[in-house]
Interface confidence: medium
């Protein structure tokens, strides 16, 4: 059902004239940024952004592609080259080091230069690189980390940790030799490397002693604490600050975020990663949008500003499973969080960036009709006379043979939240992809986000915009509304 007005050239000419008018009026905000927010869509390549845009539009009963995402409204866009020092196609650890610390590293290592070697503990010391979040804290700003994965996962860990192995979530995940050499697990680094004001996400089991029952799943032993050192890291973190509060469910989060006596907040809502949005129990677990709002409420109290990292971390997991439904519903929630943050902050004093760490081998093609379900079938049949979907994967668990042939697929099947899109090559997990990803920017110094850049440039833009090390002599006028 094509809108009749789109058949008229005037429609497109008028729309373009409006866009041109807005572009001509666009003025860079030349002051420093008081606040920094980086939204990280894990695995959110450009094909994912496009497909999520259509899904979000269709959820609003529109045709889809014409309906802008919140991130589409950001005036400045660049491309980010995501390769790591040792791989054409990177992982979330090496990329986090780049966009959060400003230095590219090696595959599976976090917060370390490429002089460090994966899994070799003795290559850690002396190769640490400092995150923008750490520098923001040193400058007197409040800082926060929000994610739908474990808070000890690769992307958020890039903000606070230094490790040669991204999988060292707790000491139980580390070899004895690494522990003896003095390497620390990521959960320990979360509470000891720096003072983080807000920590929201999953990852309870890495904080408590082995066998400690989980408050939400007390009879499920697989969700018990994992720590071999017997420590209660939550208790240790609470003891550091008088105004610290720990919560593990949505109700407690909402109460804590409105309590003026709470200065530090840790919310861990699942033993491991948080639930996919389609599986989330809205009475028990907060959404990414709600966590973002809670974080902003607390962090905004600091007159010197804040740094906030927000990750839609399970977009990546949905893709790894070849389940586009999961990936795209996560991406839509991620965009909802961006929209909410825009309502709660001002672009006059807040630099907001939206980017991805890497892409996925996720494709969107096959000439589907406008307005047809994003999860639907291509209009024609393939050479094997069977239907195929517009969304597909280059590799992954979606490769299936039925009687030696590619299985047929129906519209009903392909629209199911559990459907795995077909793949060309069989793998246990679908892989990341190596093409450039988008960086969207809004706010003070957002105009610096332009062209094709190394991923490590992102951290430098944030540091410069807020006059953080090594750009303390940034020579920028103070942020709007400040007097010093």
């Amino acid at each position: 059902i094509i809108p009749v007005e789109e058949e008229n050239p005037d429609f497109w000419n008028r729309q373009a004239a409006e866009a041109l008018g807005a572009a001509k009026k666009l003025q860079p905000i030349q002051t420093a940024a008081k606040n920094l927010i980086i939204f990280l869509g894990d695995g959110m390549g450009v094909s994912t952004v496009t497909a999520a845009r259509i899904l979000k539009g269709q959820k609003e009963d529109k045709l889809g592609p014409e309906t802008p995402l919140a991130m589409d409204h950001f005036p400045y866009v660049a491309l980010s080259k995501t390769y790591s020092v040792d791989k054409h196609v990177p992982d979330s650890a090496a990329t986090a080091t780049a966009y959060l610390c400003g230095v590219k590293g090696n595959f599976q290592t976090i917060g370390l230069s490429a002089a460090a070697r994966y899994n070799q503990c003795n290559t850690t010391r002396g190769n640490e690189v400092v995150s923008v979040m750490n520098r923001a804290k040193k400058a007197g700003k409040s800082v926060g980390v929000v994610t739908t994965t474990r808070v000890q996962h690769a992307s958020p860990a890039g903000a606070y940790a230094h490790t040669v192995n991204r999988n060292w979530y707790s000491d139980a995940n580390m070899p004895g030799s690494a522990r003896r050499e003095g390497c620390k697990d990521i959960a320990t680094q979360l509470i000891s490397n720096m003072d983080i004001d807000v920590i929201l996400g999953g990852g309870r089991k890495y904080m408590f002693r082995m066998g400690a029952p989980d408050p939400e799943y007390p009879h499920d032993y697989s969700q018990d604490g994992t720590r071999m050192d017997g420590k209660n890291l939550v208790q240790e973190w609470l003891a550091k600050q008088q105004g610290a509060r720990y919560v593990w469910n949505r109700t407690e989060l909402m109460q804590a975020s409105l309590d003026p006596s709470v200065t530090h907040l840790m919310g861990l809502f699942e033993p491991g990663d948080m639930k996919y949005e389609i599986h989330r129990d809205p009475t028990l677990d907060p959404s990414l949008m709600e966590m973002t709002e809670a974080a902003l409420r607390l962090l905004s109290r600091n007159p010197r500003g804040f740094f906030l990292f927000v990750e839609g971390g399970r977009i990546d997991h949905g893709h790894h499973e070849s389940r586009a439904y999961r990936a795209l519903t996560e991406a839509v929630m991620f965009d909802d969080a961006i929209e909410r943050a825009g309502q709660l902050t001002s672009e006059e004093d807040t630099l907001t960036l939206v980017t991805a760490d890497h892409s996925h081998v996720f494709s969107f093609g096959a000439y589907p009709l406008r307005g047809s379900s994003i999860f639907g079938l291509a209009p024609g049949k393939a050479q094997d006379r069977k239907a195929y979907t517009a969304l597909l994967y280059g590799n992954g668990p979606g490769y299936v043979l039925k009687d030696g042939a590619r299985p047929d697929v129906t519209e009903s099947e392909s629209g199911s939240p559990e459907y795995r899109q077909q793949a060309a090559v069989p793998l246990d997990e679908e892989t990341h992809a190596g093409e450039d990803v988008a960086v969207f920017a809004r706010g003070p110094q957002a105009h610096l986000v332009h062209g094709v850049q190394e991923q490590s440039f992102i951290a430098h833009v944030m540091a410069f915009a807020a006059c953080l090390e090594p750009y303390t002599a940034c020579d920028l006028a103070p942020p709007a509304g400040t007097t010093d």
């Epitope: 639930k275 389609i278 599986h279 989330r280 809205p282 668990p397 939240p417 997990e429």
Partner: nanobody
């Protein structure tokens, strides 16, 4: 070990109704997708309806407006209310449980034994 027990199948006249239920027992993580698939004689197994623990519901086009899926999370049970039944709804109906364990590509898939539904005058 997880077990799925279906009930409610039987013989019904065209235009009639049936209610299928499927109870899951064993070690079940609270995050899951429960649903119904059916297999007509000589055909492949097709999706009928699924419902996730977060409230997402999806129906096959052929049953939309006639069938309603619902679940009782406390009882780990999923129901399928089938109204305005047609002869082409005749099939063995299978209950399905998908449990995502938070590990990438690590979902556990469980199936019931099936319950026969015959729509005939």
């Amino acid at each position: 070990q997880v077990q799925l027990v279906e009930s409610g199948g039987g013989l019904v006249q065209p235009g009639g109704s049936l209610r299928l239920s499927c109870a899951a027992s064993g070690s079940i993580f609270s995050v899951n997708t429960m649903g119904w698939y059916r297999q007509a004689p000589g055909k492949q197994r097709d999706l009928v309806a699924v419902a996730t623990s977060g409230g997402t519901i999806h129906y096959a086009d052929s049953v939309k407006g006639r069938f309603t899926i619902s679940r009782d999370n406390a009882k780990n049970t999923v129901y399928l209310q089938m109204n305005s039944l047609k002869p082409e709804d005749t099939a063995v109906y299978y209950c399905n449980l998908v449990v995502p364990y938070g590990m990438i590509a690590g979902d556990h898939d469980y199936w019931g034994q099936g319950t026969k539904v015959t729509v005939s005058s």
